[in-house]
């Protein structure tokens, strides 16, 4: 665990004669605040994905009023650092977005107005515990200067904050094989002792005494390869005997979302859907008003001039959630046909088609009937870039592999009762009707509108459909 710290040094007009006017005026005094969003740097997530490493808002800066005729200077900044706590290991490579917001303090109806002045982004490599790293970035006509660092919270140390320190047991030196904990020289590095027997290749621990398995391995000591063939449940930990994943604690167990947030599992972890008035990875940020710029991804904030009155985020197309923090999962509509894999790239949807299929939505069957077997005596019928099977009696489905229920379509007319038979179906007709499907009424004088019934069958007896 640790804290990412961001220090804003200056925000002002960039160099050159085309410097912007001050964002504040005598008529509209204003003040600045900043928002930082952090993500693991090498994640494959879309640009608009949530701030998985955390986010923070600064305090408001001092009120500033433009001096008429004077060039826009660097604007007065909020005091202090922006701090983003992280619970797990520091990833080493991270992405950041820093936004500069203006709060206008004029006589707007409904309280102050907020607007985004500038946004900068980058991906950097940074070891925890290292010195402050500096950056200068331009955004439009503005220039932002800032420094950042990641530091571990005791007892964690190391470049990823995964090693632990503890006070020395002896005053002079650390135990055998243990180093002093720089910079805490009076402490010793604590050996991270995993559960006894935990596989050194396939297991690891972040807390002493635990044994967490790498993907593909399971069991209390991570010695059992995961076998997916005979397993029904999607997650672990596992049964050491079968190697199957059995239902175990999921990321949402115990609901990590605070303040009434609802938890949903994601492939990597979990995601909190926060009630209005709260946001953050675990809905832990509260007392939010529009002044805090809670609407992400260009959402428009309405209402909420004070912490007690809720705000509403009006989200742009493609985003949803009380803070516009979630991309609309366009893949949930399952647009890819024929088992294609859906990829939401942000700017577009892409379907990765299974072998034998093509087209933007995998709608074209390249095989047609070539090499396509229809089971159970069915015949393949070509047409329109796709194939279909014309199935023999008693079979159905795409490849005639499903045993059809011949009675499912209610083929017996006029209240006749249907019986499935190995070679098809049999209709037992209601009194007064006859025919293979009971489709013909029997005339009152006993004669039929049809030729006489076959020998051995009286009108009204079940007619076998051949």
């Amino acid at each position: 665990a640790g804290v990412f710290e961001l220090q804003i040094h200056s925000f002002g007009p960039g160099p050159g004669p085309g410097a912007p006017r001050s964002p504040c005026s005598a008529r509209l005094p204003c003040r600045l605040f900043f928002r930082v969003c952090l993500k693991p740097g090498l994640s494959e997530e879309a640009a608009e994905s949530p701030c998985a490493l955390g986010a923070a808002l600064s305090a408001r800066g001092p009120v500033y009023t433009e001096q008429p005729g004077a060039p826009a200077p660097d604007l007065p900044l909020p005091d202090g650092l922006l701090q983003v706590p992280f619970r797990d290991a520091w990833p080493g490579t991270f992405s950041f977005i820093i936004e500069t917001w203006r709060e206008e303090l004029g006589d707007q109806i409904g309280g102050p107005a907020w607007s985004l002045l500038a946004r900068v982004a980058g991906r950097r490599r940074l070891a925890a515990g290292g010195p402050w790293a500096r950056d200068i970035q331009r955004a439009g006509a503005w220039e932002l200067r800032f420094s950042y660092r990641a530091r571990c919270e005791p007892p964690a140390v190391g470049t990823a904050c995964t090693r632990l320190c503890r006070p020395r047991s002896a005053p002079s030196r650390c135990g055998p094989g243990l180093r002093p904990c720089a910079p805490l020289e009076d402490e010793c590095e604590a050996p991270l002792v995993c559960r006894a027997g935990c596989s050194p290749e396939h297991g690891f621990c972040e807390q002493p005494g635990e044994c967490r398995c790498l993907e593909g391995w399971t069991g209390p000591l991570c010695t059992v390869p995961v076998s997916t063939s005979s397993c029904l449940s999607p997650r672990g930990p596992s049964s050491a005997t079968t190697g199957c994943l059995v239902p175990g604690p999921g990321p949402c167990d115990g609901n990590p979302c605070a303040n009434g947030g609802s938890c949903s599992e994601t492939p990597r972890s979990f995601e909190c859907t926060c009630p209005r008035g709260f946001y953050g990875l675990r809905c832990e940020v509260s007392g939010v008003t529009c002044a805090d710029g809670p609407c992400f991804n260009g959402g428009l904030c309405v209402g909420g001039a004070d912490p007690d009155s809720a705000y509403i985020c009006h989200c742009p197309p493609g985003f949803q959630g009380s803070n516009c923090e979630k991309r609309v999962d366009r893949c949930s509509l399952q647009p890819c046909r024929n088992g294609g894999l859906c990829l939401d790239l942000g700017h577009a949807l892409r379907c990765r088609c299974r072998a034998g299929f093509a087209g933007p939505r995998c709608e074209h069957d390249l095989d047609d009937c070539a090499g396509r077997a229809c089971a159970n005596g069915g015949t393949c019928v070509e047409g329109g870039g796709a194939h279909r099977c014309s199935c023999a009696l008693g079979f159905g489905g795409r490849d005639c592999r499903e045993r059809a229920d011949p009675c499912a379509a209610r083929p017996c007319a006029h209240g006749g009762r249907c019986y499935a038979h190995f070679s098809g179906l049999v209709c037992a007709c209601a009194p007064g009707y006859m025919g293979a499907r009971c489709e013909f009424p029997v005339h009152p004088d006993g004669a039929s509108a049809l030729p006489a019934a076959p020998p051995g069958l009286r009108p009204g007896d079940p007619q076998r459909y051949l």
Epitope: G122, R125, Q137, G140, E143
Partner: antibody, heavy 117, light 107 residues
């Protein structure tokens, strides 16, 4: 106005070192970083690294990490880039440029370095 | 490192034409893209930064657009002095990388 003036052309033998200077004027020297970018004949541009004149912090492209050194002299507002263990493929025009991490807004005129035996 | 692919690699056009050059990044770089103009024997000159911000002193016929992975430099009406080579550069990740260049020639 902002100006970056570089030292003159150099001819070096393989294995030797070259030191190119870049003198800044027209702005507060310590306010912006100085980057170095090179361009081999008929080729594209390749970023080598930068120095922050305030802190003397440097960051390099991994391709040059072990061979390049960047220094500065604040009294003359000059930055130096030294490239060692020269080989023929280091023949290029070397540019210094003022900027931050996402802009190089003023460039020197370039210094041609020829490596030939 | 992030790769930038510029297209076309060369282009012939006439004075007064509207010209578009594209730059595609190998991954999302948000809006961290700059465009530079370079004339033979000269240093590159910054035209556009952060995808669409025009550098001071650059004529307004130059404009930039795009974000994420796809970016465009447009010259609305070519002037004789615009015939040069144009490079895009990403500044999202370290090291900054340049596109291969587009040589704009007189037709």
């Amino acid at each position: 106005q902002v100006q970056l003036v570089q030292s003159g052309a150099e001819v070096k033998k393989p294995g030797a070192s070259v030191k190119v200077s870049c003198k800044a004027s027209g702005y507060t020297f310590t306010r912006y970083w100085i980057h170095w970018i090179r361009q081999a004949p008929g080729q594209g541009l390749e970023w080598m690294g930068y120095i922050n004149p305030t802190t003397v912090y440097t960051e390099f492209n991994q391709n040059f990490k072990d061979r390049v050194t960047m220094t500065r002299d604040t009294s003359t507002s000059t930055v130096y880039m030294e490239l060692s263990s020269l080989r023929s493929e280091d023949t290029a025009v070397y540019y210094c440029a003022r900027g931050g991490s996402n802009f190089f807004d003023h460039w020197g005129q370039g210094t041609t370095v020829t490596v030939s035996s | 490192a992030i790769q930038l692919t510029q297209s076309p690699s060369s282009l012939s056009a006439s004075v007064g034409d509207r010209v578009t050059i594209t730059c595609r990044a190998s991954e999302n770089i948000y809006y961290n893209l700059a465009w530079y103009q370079q004339k033979p024997g000269k240093a590159p000159k910054l035209l556009i930064y952060t995808a669409n911000s025009l550098e001071d002193g650059v004529p307004s016929r130059f404009s930039g657009s795009g974000s994420g992975t796809d970016f465009t430099l447009t010259i609305s009406s070519l002037q004789p002095e615009d015939f040069a080579t144009y490079f895009c550069k990403q500044a999202y990740d370290v090291p900054p990388t340049f596109g291969g260049g587009t040589k704009l020639e007189i037709k």
